[in-house]
C-alpha cells in the first residue's frame, strides 16, 4: 500500500495525508485527561481515476457507473489507535486504546 | 456499527448502500472464469455532520477544521471478499479469495 504525505506548503492537488494536531482542550473536552493533544492527521485532495485506489471494488463501480455513484473520495485507508485516559460519564476514569484516531495513510475509495 | 440500505426506489438522500451487480462479461473481462457476475453493491449519498460517522477521527477533524479538509464522504466501512477463478496472466488459472469486493456497509469518513 502507498499513500502521499503532504504539508501546508505542498502544491499537491491529489489525495494526500496532511498533518493535524487535535487539541482536546481547545474543544473544551475536559472529560479527556490525557493526552491533552495528539497528532491526528487528515486526508485531502482529488481522486483522479485509479490514483491511490484502495479496493478493486472502487474500479469496478467506476466501470459499472450506477446511477448516483460519486467518484472515489480521499479518505483514510489506514488508521491507528491512541491510548487515552478519560472520564466515562459514570464517575469512572478509564484507560483505553481508542481505535482509528490517527490517519496513517490516505487513499481513494 | 450501523448503515442504511437503499434501493433504486428509495428517496433517501443520506449515505446509503445500494445494490449493484457487477457483470464481468459486460466489461469484456474474459480472464475471469467465475463468477460471471456478483453482487458488489456501492455507496452513495450525503454525509451530514455526524451521520453514520465511522471514526471518532472524522468528528475531530470537523471540529479542528483544517485548511482544505473536505467534509466526510460516503464510502464503504465494511467490505467482504469473494472467491474467484481467473487467469493470472502467466497462463495459470488461480482460485483465490479476493478481498474487499463486496460492500457490506456504508458510512461517512
Amino acid at each position: 500500500d502507498f499513500g502521499l504525505d503532504c504539508d501546508e506548503h505542498s502544491t499537491e492537488s491529489r489525495c494526500c495525508r496532511y498533518p493535524l494536531t487535535v487539541d482536546f482542550e481547545a474543544f473544551g473536552w475536559d472529560w479527556i485527561i490525557a493526552p491533552k493533544r495528539y497528532k491526528a492527521n487528515y486526508c485531502s485532495g482529488e481522486c483522479e481515476f485509479v490514483f491511490l485506489q484502495k479496493y478493486p471494488h472502487t474500479h469496478l463501480v467506476h466501470q459499472a457507473n450506477p446511477r448516483g455513484s460519486a467518484g472515489p473520495c480521499c479518505t483514510p485507508t489506514k488508521m491507528s489507535p491512541i491510548n487515552m485516559l478519560y472520564f466515562n460519564g459514570k464517575e469512572q476514569i478509564i484507560y483505553g486504546k481508542i481505535p482509528a484516531m490517527v490517519v496513517d495513510r490516505c487513499g481513494c475509495s | 456499527d450501523f448503515g442504511l440500505d437503499c434501493d433504486e426506489h428509495s428517496t433517501e438522500s443520506r449515505c446509503c448502500r445500494y445494490p449493484l451487480t457487477v457483470d464481468f462479461e459486460a466489461f469484456g473481462w474474459d480472464w475471469i472464469i467465475a463468477p460471471k457476475r456478483y453482487k458488489a453493491n456501492y455507496c452513495s449519498g450525503e454525509c451530514e455532520f455526524v451521520f453514520l460517522q465511522k471514526y471518532p477521527h472524522t468528528h475531530l477533524v470537523h471540529q479542528a477544521n483544517p485548511r482544505g479538509s473536505a467534509g466526510p464522504c460516503c464510502t464503504p466501512t465494511k467490505m467482504s471478499p469473494i472467491n474467484m477463478l481467473y487467469f493470472n496472466g502467466k497462463e495459470q488459472i488461480i482460485y483465490g479469495k479476493i478481498p474487499a469486493m463486496v460492500v457490506d456497509r456504508c458510512g461517512c469518513s
Partner: antibody
C-alpha cells in the same frame, strides 16, 4: 517551576469536617485534571479523588464516596477537598497531584489527624 | 477493584547493582501502570507511566516494562540517591490502586 502547596490539615474529632486546599503555580492549572492521594502513617498510598480540568467530572473510591467532595476554582488556581463525617481511618497525609496519564507532580502534603 | 501485588516488599542492594521490582495486577490492565519513588518525609515522584514511558527528567537508568498483568521496574545501576521506597500504580480504571511498596535499602 511547578508548585503545589496543600493547607488546611489539622486535628479533628471523628464525625467532624475539614476542607483542604491546594494552591497551584508554575503551570496552566485550568488545563489539567487534578487528584488527591493520601498516605496513612507508615502505610502505602491510597487514591482519594480526581477532578477534570474544567471541574465538570469527578471520581472517588467507595471508601470516601458520599463523604468527600473534590472541587476547584480555576480563577484562583486552587484545588479543594471537602471532608465530612471523618473517621479515624481517614488519618493520613493528604497530597494533591497534577494529573496526566499518571500523577506527574505532587505537593508536599498536609497531615489530617482524626482523633477524639 | 484491581489489586496490585508488589514484590519484594524490601531489598538490600549496593551502589552499582541492578535492581528489579515487580508488580502483578489482579486483572489485565493493558499498559496502564505507573511507578513512583518516595523518600522518607517527602512526596512521591513519578518515574514511569504507561508501563514504559520515562517521565521528563528521570534518569535513563530507570526503565519500565510489561503489559497485561506483569510489570517490572528496573534500575540498571543503583545510585546513592536511589535508596527509597518504590510504588506501582494502575491507572487502567478507577478506583486507582497502588502496590504495597518496595523499600530499597543499602546493603
Amino acid at each position: 517551576e511547578v508548585q503545589l502547596l496543600e493547607s488546611g490539615g489539622g486535628l479533628v474529632q471523628p464525625g467532624g469536617s475539614l476542607r483542604l486546599s491546594c494552591a497551584a503555580s508554575g503551570f496552566t492549572f485550568s488545563s489539567y485534571a487534578m487528584s488527591w492521594v493520601r498516605q496513612a502513617p507508615g502505610k502505602g498510598l491510597e487514591w482519594v479523588s480526581t477532578i477534570s480540568s474544567g471541574g465538570s467530572y469527578t471520581s472517588y473510591p467507595d471508601s470516601v464516596k458520599g463523604r468527600f467532595t473534590i472541587s476547584r476554582d480555576n480563577s484562583k488556581n486552587t484545588l479543594y477537598l471537602q471532608m465530612n463525617s471523618l473517621r479515624a481511618e481517614d488519618t493520613a497525609v493528604y497530597y494533591c497531584a497534577k494529573q496526566d496519564y499518571a500523577m506527574n507532580y505532587w505537593g508536599q502534603g498536609t497531615l489530617v489527624t482524626v482523633s477524639s | 477493584d484491581i489489586q496490585m501485588t508488589q514484590s519484594p516488599s524490601s531489598l538490600s542492594a549496593s551502589v552499582g547493582d541492578r535492581v528489579t521490582i515487580t508488580c502483578k495486577a489482579s486483572q489485565d490492565v493493558s499498559t496502564a501502570v505507573a511507578w513512583y519513588q518516595q523518600k522518607p518525609g517527602k512526596a512521591p515522584k513519578l518515574l514511569i507511566y504507561s508501563a514504559s514511558y520515562r517521565y521528563t527528567g528521570v534518569p535513563s537508568r530507570f526503565s519500565g516494562s510489561g503489559s497485561g498483568t506483569d510489570f517490572t521496574l528496573t534500575i540498571s545501576s543503583l545510585q546513592p540517591e536511589d535508596f527509597a521506597t518504590y510504588y506501582c500504580q494502575q491507572h487502567y480504571s478507577t478506583p486507582w490502586t497502588f502496590g504495597g511498596g518496595t523499600k530499597v535499602e543499602i546493603k
